[in-house]
């Protein structure tokens, strides 16, 4: 049950009050509002609307709301110069080109400034060659392709199909393939779900649609040129050769009308087995190069897109509390887009305004919330999570003293058929009592709770009765306050079913085709959806902020912590031989665990029975439960990654978006059996199991009896 | 500054055929997706027919069967080619192409009536 403990509390200054107050009405005003024009990071649109959502939020009632601006690394097509991919034949003439733009949906016809498909951080450079069909790009498409195949990439320029992982990934995978060019897809069996029209009659993308993004591997840096430090005014910059994560070669994204142009000519090896073809009528050839008749056709991309310094602009406002000033609770989410941003963020961004105005409308009634609540609209997130990585880093020292849980608000919806929840452990509690006390929106459901229906649709794999939480990853706003930070952190939005819809997030996911009718006609039209994600977000974000012993639970982690000990050995005892030649042992890892869970258990029993109206008691139990997870971070960093910090996640090394248990040790072991140097290797698997077992100990320390 | 000069249209007889140009003076919209839109007396505008830089082509249900398009690359023009024409295919056309912002032809007019 919500506790409804802040002062000046009145019986209607509670949860309830809050909830009460969030209205699906008020959301839909507000993403119509957000989604009109493009509001593309470092435009002039973008900062307006920075200015608009500053005021809005001053009217709502937060005690104060500032522009916190950095000048960081961004990247532009040139509009002189376009970007596009040819065929050309033996003479040099180019007898196929790719579209430049996205024909507009209906009613954006005159909307200027829409910027085209591109891939952000490309360099410049007009390869040609042959091309290799690649798959998803993903590690193991290119063990098979390398290893079985035997085909080398080697001054190739692949063809890739979106999914399964962070774009970033694939173009990492294609450079140290030795690839000179990148060309990006997305396939209709990843975009494209059966019995669904294509936009504007449906949701599915259509043949001229193209998904943007950013290609960078900056595993957590921030802006590319002030790694580590904000981009301020008096900021030392790198020189664009040492920035960190940009890709060494040309990278660019096409629909697959044009993709079937390419692909249909594709001669060379045919695909490994089924997993390799997609929907489209073309055999999936692996090349290299095109077939018979067009064996002396190439391929060319032109590219001539920019990276410029630019000014972006995050909105902060703060709700200062009244008992515990000091102690921070953030909901985060950005404002940048694409380009409408119909779902990506402005369902999210819509959803926070939502917020602000009900606890600003509790405020106005004399109420305050217990802790201090921040709110942030972050820039330049699609450009690396840019706005949020740098108020971090401008903020570091206060945040990991006073940062409570961070709770992320993007995309409020990736389709309409349950609740997904990924977080820190030490929410689950949280999360199911919450959820239990909420009604569900779902068809079916009605009259009964949130938890149930998506208990129902979601069950998790390893508890009956109760649902999937999965872990954090990253490609948000989350990343520096969880992976480098070690502050808790969640994100909570309604997703699709993903037993019968295997297509690879939403279809028209950084398309032109993501606008406000989008969402108002196909995927949410009462905006009950976006409501239940409201009452999620706001309703964690209240609780933590407002009950008098923080809702963490810590047992829950030493659940996790053993089950994820249990996986990596699991996977080391895939070479039981190697673990007997080199002395290998889970035994410290397995023992620390033990340790921590019965010292959580211990503190567990403390924190019911300790005198909870002597303050100084109180707080000292609250700061063991808001530095427990800042316990996981090692000051080191992992291997070659120094900005993911947490020894217990981190996002997987193969793909941005997912996260990964023990990333140490994961790391350490994959791909063992291919080491040049075997001893060297598992070296490094001890090191890493040694840094675990000695991060978990240090973490249940502190939750030990302080003297 | 770039140009969409649209030529064709006129009075036809139902059953009967026309059809329309439009020559742009742009080189990059010879790499660039090119519509047929039309608007017909005290209705919204509709999308006709779509063609991208590689010749793939869309169109509307209302026209699919008896409109093509198609584009000549080497003169910068486009062309719809308007078969059985019927009543309901009166209203003025335009070409339109896209590029950071709308570029519209200056429109055609046609007319299908016996």
């Known amino acids: 049950k919500s506790s409804n403990e802040a002062t000046n509390i009145t019986p209607k200054h509670n949860m309830k009050a809050f909830l009460d107050e969030l209205k699906a009405e008020n959301i839909k005003k507000f993403l119509y509002n957000f989604t009109q024009i493009p509001h593309l990071a470092g435009t002039e649109q973008n900062f307006q609307l920075a200015k608009q959502i500053q005021s809005q939020w001053k009217e709502f009632g937060l005690d104060s709301v500032e522009l916190a601006h950095y000048d960081v690394l961004l990247s532009y097509p040139n509009k002189t110069h376009p970007n596009y991919i040819s065929i050309i034949n033996e003479d040099g003439n180019e007898i196929f080109n790719t579209s430049l733009f996205e024909p507009p949906p209906p009613g954006y016809e005159n909307v200027s400034d829409i910027v085209p498909p591109f891939s952000a951080f490309s360099p410049q450079g007009m390869p040609e060659g042959d091309l290799v069909y690649v798959n998803y790009a993903r590690t193991e498409d290119f063990f098979k392709l390398e290893r079985d195949m035997k085909i080398n990439c080697s001054g190739k320029i692949v063809i890739a199909r979106y999914g399964k992982v962070f774009r970033g990934n694939k173009v990492k995978n294609a450079q140290l393939a030795g690839a000179k060019g990148v060309i990006l897809y997305s396939d209709p069996a990843d975009y494209f779900a059966p019995g669904v029209k294509s936009y504007p009659d449906g949701w599915n993308l259509p043949g001229g649609g193209v998904q943007r993004g950013n290609i960078l591997n900056l595993n957590g840096a921030g802006d590319p040129l002030t790694p580590g430090y904000p981009a301020n005014e008096y900021a030392y910059r790198r020189g664009i050769a040492e920035a960190v994560g940009l890709p060494s070669i040309p990278v660019h994204p096409i629909g697959y009308y044009d993709a079937q142009k390419l692909l249909e000519k594709m001669g060379g090896s045919a695909p490994p087995d089924s997993s390799w073809r997609g929907s489209l009528k073309v055999p999936y050839n692996v090349g290299p190069g095109f077939t018979g008749n067009f064996s002396t056709q190439k391929v060319k991309m032109h590219i001539h897109s920019t990276n410029e310094v630019t000014r972006i602009y995050n909105v902060i406002g703060t709700l200062r509390g009244a008992v515990e000033p000091d102690r921070y609770v953030i909901l985060g989410g950005h404002r940048d887009s694409w380009v409408f941003g119909g779902i990506d963020p402005q369902s999210g961004a819509a959803v926070v305004h939502e917020i602000v105005r009900s606890f600003g409308t509790l405020k106005k009634e004399g109420w305050r919330p217990r802790r201090t609540i921040l709110f942030a609209s972050w820039d330049a997130e699609e450009f690396g999570l840019l706005g949020s990585t740098e108020w971090a880093e401008e903020n570091s020292r206060l945040l990991q003293e006073r940062g409570v849980a961070y709770i992320n608000a993007d995309s409020s919806i990736e389709g309409n058929y349950t609740l997904r929840v990924d977080c820190t452990p030490l929410m689950y509690s949280l999360v199911h009592n919450l959820t239990k006390e909420l009604k569900s929106p779902d068809e079916g459901f009605e009259g009964k709770s949130l938890y149930e229906s998506w208990t129902k649709k979601s069950p998790s794999p390893e508890f009956s009765g109760m649902p999937r939480i999965s872990k954090l990853g990253s490609g948000n706003d989350f990343e520096v306050f969880f992976q480098r930070l070690g502050i808790a952190s969640g994100r909570a939005r309604y997703t699709k079913n993903w037993e019968t819809n295997k297509f690879s997030g939403y279809p028209l996911y950084h398309s032109v085709y993501e606008t406000y009718e989008l969402v108002e006609k196909f995927y949410d039209p009462m905006f009950k959806y976006h409501l239940t994600v409201a009452q999620v977000r706001g309703g964690m974000v209240f609780e933590l902020a407002n009950s008098i012993v923080l809702p963490f639970d810590c047992r829950d982690y030493a659940v996790v912590l053993r089950k994820y000990a249990d996986k990596i050995y699991s996977i080391s005892m895939k070479h039981p031989q190697e673990m007997k030649t080199y002395s290998v042992s889970f035994d410290s890892l397995f023992s620390a665990v033990k340790n921590f869970t019965e010292i959580a258990s211990k503190f567990s029993e403390r924190l019911q029975d300790f005198d909870k109206s002597n303050p100084i008691v109180l707080r000292m139990m609250n700061d063991q439960l808001m530095f427990l997870e800042r316990a996981f971070i090692d000051p080191l960093g992992l291997p070659d990654r120094p900005f993911y910090r947490h020894v217990i996640y981190a996002p997987s090394s193969h793909n941005k978006y997912a996260g990964e248990s023990f990333p140490g040790i994961y790391d350490a072991l994959f791909d063992i059996e291919s080491k040049v140097d075997p001893s060297k290797a598992w070296g490094e698997v001890k090191r890493q199991i040694y840094v675990a077992a000695f991060t978990v100990q240090a973490a249940a320390e502190t939750l030990s009896e302080v003297a | 500054q770039v140009q969409l000069q649209q030529s064709g249209g006129g009075l036809v007889q139902p059953g009967g055929s026309l059809r329309l140009s439009c020559a742009d003076s742009g080189s990059i919209f010879r790499i660039n997706t090119m519509h047929w839109y039309r608007q017909a007396p005290g209705k919204q505008r509709e999308l006709v027919a779509t063609?991208?830089?590689?010749?793939?082509?869309n169109y509307a249900d209302s026209v699919k069967g008896r409109f093509t398009i198609s584009r000549d690359n080497t003169k910068n023009t486009m062309y719809l080619q308007m078969n059985s024409l019927k009543a309901e295919d009166t209203a003025v056309y335009y070409c339109?192409?896209?590029?950071?912002?709308?570029?519209w032809g200056q429109g055609t007019q046609v007319t299908v009536s016996s």
């Open positions: 063609i991208t830089s590689g010749g793939s082509t």
């Open positions: 339109y192409t896209y590029y950071y912002r709308a570029y």
